[in-house]
């Protein structure tokens, strides 16, 4: 494995490319920090499921970011 | 079709190495997060270590680090787990397990794992 060092990120890999859009409970999107440079988008899945990191550079996560950042600003 | 299948388990003394394998094929092994886990005759089944091989990251619960270390070959899509200075507790069916999208939050959950191998049985006398 290449080590590198870096801030404490909550996903681990790419994430997943796309998720159900019927199964999203939650889209929460963490923007680089400190913490970890990159930005990650957490989806919680729906009826306890848990929750996946949703790979940043999809299309998916690439609307759900922009959807959030309408809504936000 | 998605498989992962483990080799390298057996009967070693305490004190003495082995090193698992995991050969995984039917999905691009950069895009999985690949962890280890043991089940002991009883016991609920517990995480051991954890990576992803896009990203370098490498996790170790408590009672295996300073002596197992995780690491991969992606020309092979296999993922190894050396296991060093074994005690008569490592004494388990060890499994991998892959997924997309894990959390470092719920990577010792292995309801967070879609794909599991058959295991390979570790035994340590003492």
């Known amino acids: 494995f290449p080590m590198f060092k870096r801030g404490r990120c909550l996903c681990i890999g790419p994430g997943v490319k796309a998720v159900k859009v019927a199964d999203i409970e939650k889209a929460s999107i963490m923007y680089p920090s400190n913490n970890c440079d990159k930005i990650e988008v957490i989806i919680t899945l729906k009826e306890n499921k848990g929750q996946r990191c949703l790979n940043p550079k999809s299309k998916q996560a690439r609307l759900i970011i922009k959807k959030v950042e309408r809504k936000n600003f | 079709e998605v498989q992962l299948v483990e080799s390298g388990g057996g009967l070693v003394q305490a004190g003495g190495s082995l090193r698992l394998s995991c050969e995984a094929s039917?999905?691009?092994?950069?895009?999985?997060?690949i962890g280890w886990f043991r089940q002991a005759p009883g016991k609920e089944r517990e995480g051991v270590s954890c990576c992803s091989s896009s990203d370098g990251s490498t996790y170790y619960a408590d009672s295996v680090k300073g002596r197992f270390t995780i690491s991969s070959d992606n020309a092979k899509n296999t993922v190894y787990l050396q296991m060093n200075s074994l005690k008569p507790e490592d004494t388990a069916v060890y499994y991998c397990?892959?997924?997309?999208?894990?959390?470092?939050?719920?990577?010792?959950?292995?309801?967070?794992?879609?794909?599991w191998g058959q295991g390979t049985q570790v035994t340590v006398s003492s």
């Open positions: 397990a892959a997924t997309q999208g894990l959390l470092i939050a719920t990577m010792w959950n292995p309801a967070s794992y879609d794909y």
């Open positions: 039917g999905f691009t092994f950069d895009d999985y997060a």
